[in-house]
Interface confidence: low
């Protein structure tokens, strides 16, 4: 009969290296009599016999982990006890060897130029993987701006446009290499104007091209503003190449203005904007008429048809390529500006503008335009349209127009001939369908000029003669 014998572990446990999802086995060979009871612990916690992840065989001497997980690493011990003497224990470590695995891969990033970008790349693996980065097809070199952090993440300080591109992280250890998917680092750049539009001083009716070039990422959009409002006329062409947008605004100039090019691009929910402005001013209408050549012809337009005398000859200025069209376009532009003026001012202003743009013409060897008499001009300015005139001059002072009344082609009253000096040298305005009683209700106006400048016309004319040729429409 055998003698009882205390357990002896003849094959101590060794360190076991195992790959994830592979099988790992610890052997705990025991000699004893009677047969010992063998139990297993992991990190001092008893492994339950019914845990299906494990297989215990050979009377408990073989412990097999059927599919190793990275969480299985630790210290495994076998304890043998048969009641004879004390229990014996042998321990060994399970080192879960793991091919590199990227647990938090990088993601596409949009970052504004100059800020800091971090592309994550958290890895697992045993041995611990080393992490490197590839940009495009080349290994990324670290420098003062670019560093791979201990965590594996890529940090780029002061992001530059050239940092944009496709990146992937590479995790490598002795068991293998893992690559992340390609991710895109997009460097967004605030909209910036590379080429601002140039200011122009042109004659009425000429074409001007304003050009504005802007850069940004994403490519900016360019819009044009005319005197604070969206451009109402003109042709806009634009093209995009290499993140640069080039916009050309082509204008037919009938009035001066401040044109602003606005380049805008979007960064997430925010927008960046860059602006550049140019002025387009018109060489003075009165100057363009000085020493001008022209011809006398019947007025065939529409705008002034009700204002000008029927079949009257008016002067057309041949300094314009198409005088009749040009002058009609100018009066049409002016007419639109008059929509907002008072009912008292409007007919007076219409008559003044029409007779100024389409001056009575004396045919002869040299066709000669006859300007409006100064007194009538002053009456419109200081009586009928005093408020409007002041408002318009206010706009000029604020710098929107180069000088004076350039928004409307109004004459400079002081430069016009007086009807008192030579009644035949100037044109009277047979206009204003107002009766004498309306005139007498004018508010008192404090004139900025001596009252002697205000026309002193016969009382029977209600200050102005009513022409049968003029009718309000």
């Amino acid at each position: 009969e055998k003698l009882p014998k205390a357990p002896v572990i003849t094959t101590p446990l060794e360190t076991v290296d195992a790959l994830v999802e592979e099988v790992a086995t610890f052997m705990c060979a025991v000699e004893s009599y009677p047969q010992p009871e063998i139990s297993w612990t992991r990190n001092k916690i008893l492994i339950k016999l019914f845990d299906t992840r494990y297989s215990i065989r050979e009377n408990g001497q073989l412990l097999t982990i059927l599919s190793v997980e990275d969480s299985d690493d630790g210290i495994y011990c076998c304890i043998a006890n048969n009641g004879v003497g004390g229990a014996v224990e042998s321990c060994g470590a399970l080192q879960v060897k793991m091919k590199p695995k990227i647990t938090r891969p990088p993601i596409n990033v949009k970052i504004i130029e100059g800020l800091k970008a971090v592309l994550p790349c958290t890895t697992m693996g045993n041995p611990k993987p080393s992490v490197s980065w590839i940009k495009g097809d080349n290994a990324l070199r670290e420098n003062s701006r670019i560093a791979v952090l201990e965590s594996g993440s890529l940090r780029i300080h002061n992001v530059q446009k050239e940092d944009a591109g496709q990146y992937r992280c590479v995790a490598k250890n002795s068991l293998g290499t893992a690559y992340s998917k390609l991710v895109k680092l997009e460097v967004e750049v605030f909209a910036r104007i590379l080429r601002a539009p140039e200011s122009h001083n042109v004659t009425f009716g000429s074409f001007v091209t304003l050009r504005c070039t802007a850069i940004g990422i994403p490519v900016p959009t360019i819009s044009w503003i005319e005197n604070g409002n969206a451009v109402s006329s003109g042709s806009i062409q634009e093209s995009v190449k290499d993140r640069v947008i080039d916009s050309r605004l082509q204008l037919f100039i009938t009035k001066p203005g401040l044109y602003t090019c606005i380049a805008t691009n979007k960064h997430g929910e925010k927008f960046s904007t860059a602006k550049a402005a140019a002025t387009v001013s018109i060489a003075e209408w009165s100057k363009s008429q000085k020493d001008s050549q022209g011809y006398c012809a019947q007025y065939r337009g529409e705008v002034c048809d009700a204002v000008l005398a029927k079949d009257a000859l008016v002067f057309f200025n041949t300094s314009y390529r198409d005088p009749e069209d040009a002058q009609e376009l100018l009066i049409h532009t002016a007419w639109n500006e008059l929509k907002a003026v008072s009912p008292l001012c409007r007919p007076a202003a219409e008559a003044l503008l029409c007779n100024h743009l389409f001056q009575e013409c004396s045919p002869g060897v040299v066709p000669t335009p006859m300007p409006i008499c100064r007194e009538y001009c002053l009456a419109v300015k200081e009586l009928f349209c005093a408020k409007e005139w002041q408002a318009m001059e206010g706009k000029a002072h604020r710098g929107l127009y180069r000088s004076g009344m350039h928004l409307l082609p109004v004459p400079e009253c002081s430069k016009l001939p007086s009807m008192h000096r030579d009644p035949t040298a100037c044109t009277r305005l047979p206009y204003l369908d107002y009766k004498k009683e309306n005139i007498t209700t004018f508010p008192s106006i404090t004139s900025s000029r001596p009252s002697a400048d205000i026309p002193n016309l016969p009382a029977s004319t209600s200050s102005f003669a009513v022409s049968p040729a003029y009718s309000m429409t």
Epitope: E198, F207, T209, T213, S235, Q237, E238, S239, K241, D242, V244, D246, R248, Q250
Partner: antibody, heavy 121, light 107 residues
Framework: EVQLVESGGGLVKPGGSLRLSCAAS????????MHWVRQAPGKGLEWVSS????????YYADSVKGRFTISRDNAKNSLYLQMNSLRAEDTAVYYC??????????????WGQGTLVTVSS | DIQMTQSPSSLSASVGDRVTITCRAS??????LNWYQQKPGKAPKLLIY???NLQSGVPSRFSGSGSGTDFTLTISSLQPEDFATYYC?????????FGQGTKLEIK
């Protein structure tokens, strides 16, 4: 490949009319300004007319204003020039040209082979 | 309209010569200036755009310079295929005026 093919030229009497066509292919016609340029026999190039991509703006040389009309049909990728009240001095080879506007001043980067218009009694 | 004046109107030169053609605008046109080459019976061909930019596919012996009103087309070393008529064109205004042309002939 960008291709512009003019047609519609021929002999016409003074005062008569003619309609030129230009068929475009190989590019997105509807996004380009297009032009007509002519060249009288033995003479230099003379720009005739232009039309913006969506027909909003049309321009004409002084010599043809009021007589010629430019138009386009983007659905058909076609450019047209309707010529009325033709004169002997309108005799020329008429070219259609594409206006390439890309980061720089416009330029006519593609031309058709031209179609000859002869105005003679 | 903007007038474009080319000089000379004709020019005789030999293969290998350096040739310069000038173009003057009647008003400042910034760099809105293009150069074209035309051979008999053919459509014009764009050489230079924006005063100094070489059109794709054009040999580098062609170059352009200038800004404002005065512009120059230079052929650094004439080749047999360069004998043709050259036109400048302004694209600053929608009249797109051409110069009268410079005919380059073999000496």
């Amino acid at each position: 490949e960008v291709q512009l093919v003019e047609s519609g030229g021929g002999l016409v009497k003074p005062g008569g009319s003619l309609r030129l066509s230009c068929a475009a292919s190989g590019f997105t016609f509807s996004t380009y300004t297009m032009h007509w340029v002519r060249q009288a026999p033995g003479k230099g190039l003379e720009w005739v007319s232009s039309i913006s991509s969506r027909s909003a703006y049309k321009y004409y040389a002084d010599s043809v204003k009021g007589r010629f009309t430019i138009s386009r049909d983007n659905a058909k990728n076609s450019l047209y020039l309707q010529m009325n009240s033709l004169r002997a001095e309108d005799t020329a080879v008429y070219y259609c040209a594409r206006d390439f506007f890309q980061l720089g001043p416009p330029r006519f980067d593609s031309w058709g082979q031209g179609t000859l218009v002869t105005v003679s009694s | 309209d903007i007038q474009m004046t080319q000089s000379p109107s004709s020019l005789s030169a030999s293969v290998g010569d350096r040739v310069t053609i000038t173009c003057r605008a009647s008003q400042r046109i910034s760099s809105f200036l293009n150069w074209y080459q035309q051979k008999p019976g053919k459509a014009p061909k764009l050489l230079i755009y924006g005063a100094s930019n070489l059109q794709s596919g054009v040999p580098s012996r062609f170059s352009g310079s200038g800004s404002g009103t005065d512009f120059t087309l230079t052929i650094s070393s004439l080749q047999p295929e360069d004998f043709a008529t050259y036109y400048c064109q302004q694209s600053y205004s929608p009249s797109y005026t051409f110069g009268q042309g410079t005919k380059l002939e073999i000496k």
